[in-house]
């Protein structure tokens, strides 16, 4: 099979699949496309995984390149390390395999780089510009388990057709990921659909045993079934309903579990109750009632804005103090009048791209789980710590579920691995503590308050973030009306021990929103709550010094929360790195854990240790934090995030946001 045919192809093992998508994309577009299907760009870390990639890619043309999930920020060269300073998009630098095309050469590494794999020959790794739209990309999908391909039966009309959760359809799989559908056509004209499901005794298996093609129990009147009639092994028939319906009490007719609108925002058939509720981006399920949706405050997240953050229903915006202006990335502040490149497009064109209908987004493979189960890593699935998926899968697929990104797409990207973008489906580790700067940010004087827009324009349908199922881990979201928060960039701890681990850290329990990529957990969070602001007036902002008590009743309130962080043992087994290189035979490079420097978060501002409010214990090692791809260059000046495809009830003026409310909330995840 020619991998450069129009259709994607994949190869699956018992715990993960690789898929090749021959579609021209930039690195960011490719990363998004894999993420939207529930996976990540391929991270072949072992010789065995690399062999599977080799088999999948085959012998392509020398001119073709495929993105894999490796990227490096500018000036992050570490040529002595196996990955040379590159980081997997899963957030870490662990590897037991490399395949660089050339030996490492010294240099300043002035620009961000991403890695593509040659389609020909040895499938060597080449580095280059992340904004280049190369010929295709490799995704990796992990899962809890897999079902073996079905054995052909005598009565079959042809081979079973399998559809995976990531929308690849083929007859040639050896293993089928949990949640896959097998369609078997029988010579008698009927067929059977099987689902790869969890078995009561543990593990996964097909939803029914063979033989699948015998008897004629359904032939008269479809066995009395409204939708599907299934002939059981013992000869009797049972009725099933097509995706989106459940069997009614009579055992024959089918009903739509979402017809009575049991969910506040979105309902999807499947799950234990026959349906599962989902919240739009920017919202999360209420803990006391999973049918309702509430939201969280992005401004609580350390480093989400460099200076000031205003939160509103379903979104937030960053602002700068007097004498500073918002940088093109929509987050950073620089002295007014400083030269800086500006992106020429609005945010909507860039972050909220792909132009998909809300309907299409709803139909995407958003949820593997019923109810509100939040899973620790659909997107960084790995064999050693698989996520626990419950099943809520609808086996009806459009012909091409590949995200349709208009080409050529402008390549302003959101910042990668920076704690800014409430991009959907992020599964984020929160085992790194943060050091919050105790120095005061520069804030507007009382005489010249900043001008904050009083209205938040709704984005057009084309510019809205896709709807996300709530049983992906929750994203930090905005619902506290109008709270300005002064947050400081996160700092790496000064003396943390290095760690190499092949396991991902645990995530928080269900209903606790994980942090954004590269956001670190703060023991102390300074949130400045402001009094109510009349419409069309800018807020007057003051802030407290590091140890300065409130001076007046209306002064901002400091809220301090002690966060209990999980402690991960630092003793880790060493990794052995296998390297394929054209200049030398494959060799083994031992990379002891003790010698590898920690994978620091990228793009942290430099601050002196004296600005740190609390020392960080070395018992909190770095975790591997998933990174959002970041492409070079400026990003839009105003960061405006709207989570839903339908306009949210954002206040039309800051005054309506009731900034005076001091809403106490359970922010255990901060």
């Amino acid at each position: 099979q020619d991998p450069w045919a129009a259709e994607p192809r994949s190869a699956c093992g018992p715990s993960s699949c690789y898929a090749l998508f021959p579609r021209r994309r930039t690195f960011l577009e490719a990363w998004r496309a894999c993420r939207e299907l529930g996976g990540d760009l391929a991270t072949p870390r072992t010789p065995e995984e690399a062999q599977r990639v080799d088999n999948l890619v085959g012998a392509g043309p020398a001119s073709r390149l495929l993105w894999i999930g490796l990227q490096r920020q500018a000036r992050q060269c570490q040529l002595q390390r196996p990955l040379r300073g590159f980081t997997w998009t899963t957030g870490d630098q662990d590897t037991a395999f490399t395949n660089w095309a050339q030996p490492a050469t010294g240099g300043p590494c002035p620009a961000q780089r991403c890695v593509a794999l040659e389609a020909s020959g040895e499938h060597r790794w080449l580095e280059g510009s992340c904004t280049l739209a190369v010929d295709g990309y490799l995704c990796q999908f992990g899962f809890e388990g897999a079902c073996p391909a079905l054995q052909d039966e005598a009565g079959q009309a042809g081979p079973a057709v399998y559809t995976t959760p990531f929308h690849l359809v083929s007859t040639e799989f050896e293993w089928l990921p949990f949640g896959s559908v097998a369609a078997v056509q029988c010579q008698a004209g009927r067929g059977a659909s099987l689902l790869c499901v969890k078995q009561p005794e543990g593990g996964v298996g097909w939803s029914r045993a063979g033989p699948l093609c015998l008897g004629a129990g359904c032939s008269p009147d479809n066995g009395g079934c409204e939708h599907e009639c299934v002939e059981e092994v013992d000869g009797h028939v049972s009725c099933r309903c097509t995706e989106g319906f459940r069997l009614a009490a009579d055992g024959r007719s089918c009903e739509d579990p979402c017809a009575q609108a049991p969910c506040e925002q979105q309902c999807e058939p499947g799950g234990p109750q026959g349906y599962s509720c989902h919240c739009r981006l920017g919202f999360r399920p209420a803990e006391d009632d999973p049918h309702r949706c509430v939201d969280t405050d992005e401004c609580q997240i350390a480093g989400v804005c460099q200076q000031m953050c205003v939160n509103y229903v379903g979104g937030f915006e960053c602002y700068c103090s007097e004498g500073h202006e918002l940088e093109a990335d929509g987050i950073s502040c620089s002295p007014a009048g400083a030269m800086g490149a500006r992106a020429s497009q609005d945010l909507g064109d860039e972050l909220l791209d792909d132009g998909e209908d809300e309907e299409d987004e709803d139909e995407a493979w958003e949820a593997f789980g019923g109810g509100w189960t939040e899973m620790p890593g659909i997107l960084w699935m790995e064999p050693t710590q698989p996520p626990d998926f419950a099943l809520a899968y609808r086996p009806s697929f459009p012909e091409d579920r590949e995200p349709q990104i208009p080409y050529p797409e402008p390549t302003w990207p959101p910042p990668l691995s920076a704690p800014r973008v409430p991009y959907h489906s992020s599964v984020l580790s929160v085992t790194r503590p943060v050091v919050v700067s105790a120095t005061r940010p520069t804030l507007p004087s009382a005489h010249q308050p900043p001008v904050i827009p009083a209205t938040h324009p709704a984005l057009s349908r084309d510019h809205q973030i896709p709807v996300i199922a709530a049983n992906y881990p929750d994203l930090p979201s905005a619902y506290q009306p109008g709270i300005l928060s002064v947050s400081h960039p996160a700092q790496p701890p000064a003396h943390q021990p290095p760690m190499i681990s092949t396991r991902y850290p645990e995530l928080f329990p269900a209903h606790q929103s994980p942090m954004f990529p590269d956001t670190q957990v703060a023991g102390t969070q300074t949130t400045t709550h402001l009094p109510a602001i009349p419409p069309n007036r800018a807020p007057l902002v003051t802030t407290l010094g590091a140890h300065q008590p409130p001076q007046a009743p209306d002064a901002p309130v400091l809220r301090t929360q002690a966060t209990q962080l999980p402690i991960i043992p630092t003793a880790q087994p060493s990794l052995t790195t296998s390297s394929r290189s054209p200049v030398s035979p494959a060799h083994q490079v031992s990379v002891p854990a003790a010698t590898q420097p920690p994978a620091l978060p990228t793009l942290l501002p430099s601050q002196s240790p004296t600005n740190q409010t609390s020392p960080i214990s070395p018992t909190h090692p770095h975790s591997k934090v998933p990174q959002i791809p970041r492409e070079d260059g400026p990003s839009p000046k105003l960061a405006l995030w709207l989570p839903s495809a339908a306009p949210t009830a954002a206040p039309t003026a800051l005054g309506e946001a009731s900034l005076a409310e001091h809403i106490q909330r359970d922010d255990r995840w901060l």
Epitope: W4, S63, R64, A101, L132, T411
Partner: antibody, heavy 124, light 108 residues
């Protein structure tokens, strides 16, 4: 060594079609994409389209509204570019150029080798 | 389309001078920028690829820098054979290449 040798100059009437060739040598023809770029007198270089000889995949600059067709003859390691409905605005030097794949461990899509150019003059 | 604007369009310099040519893109092009040298009656020659990487055989006096929207080509010490026209090219939305209008470097 790598060489791209283009066909000779052409003088054409308005409304006519011109087809020029670009013969590649010194490398495996199907391993590299061929682009066509033109340069009108005193104007900047303008990309017209490309072909991947491996599978005849082509993409064209929308500006040429279907007037351009790029083909290859793999057996002859030669690329061709045909431009129809010529006008005086099409008077230019037409270059074929090879897109590089990788240099010293970097992938890149710059054009590493160029033909010498074919001058096309459109005049009534 | 992404537009590239070079400055200056013309410049005069002497042998031994340090020369800097700037190329601005109308939107972010990452580092997908190349620089070419073209002499009268000849095809362009690749000097710099991926914004800052010197192509094989190009003298070390040529260097490139920049990312995003602003790029520079620097000739550290001008030689007589360097008088030519220089073009920047972007290919971030490959295959839709665009070129700058050129900078003609003349002997003072």
């Amino acid at each position: 060594q790598v060489q791209l040798v283009q066909s000779g100059p052409e003088v054409m009437k308005p409304g006519a079609s011109v087809k020029m060739s670009c013969k590649a040598s010194g490398y495996t023809f199907t391993d590299y994409v061929i682009h066509w770029v033109r340069q009108a007198p005193g104007k900047r270089l303008e990309w017209m389209g490309y072909i991947n000889p491996y599978d005849d995949d082509t993409t064209y600059n929308q500006k040429f509204k279907g007037r351009v067709t790029i083909t290859v003859d793999k057996s002859a390691s030669t690329a061709y570019m045909e431009l129809n409905s010529l006008t005086s605005e099409d008077t230019a030097v037409y270059y074929c150029a090879r897109r590089g794949n990788s240099y010293d461990g970097y992938f890149d899509y710059s054009m590493d080798y160029w033909g010498q150019g074919t001058l096309v003059t459109v005049s009534s | 389309d992404i537009q590239l604007t070079q400055s200056p369009s013309f410049m005069s310099a002497s042998v031994g001078d340090r020369v800097t040519i700037t190329c601005r893109a109308s939107q972010n092009v990452g580092t997908a920028v190349a620089w070419y040298q073209q002499k009268p009656g000849q095809a362009p020659k690749l000097l710099i690829y991926s914004a800052s990487n010197r192509y094989t055989g190009v003298p070390s006096r040529f260097s490139g820098s920049g990312s995003g929207t602003e790029f520079t080509l620097t000739i550290s010490s001008l030689q007589s054979e360097d008088f030519a026209t220089y073009y920047c090219q972007q290919y971030t939305n490959y295959p839709m290449y665009t070129f700058g209008q050129g900078t003609k470097l003349e002997i003072k």
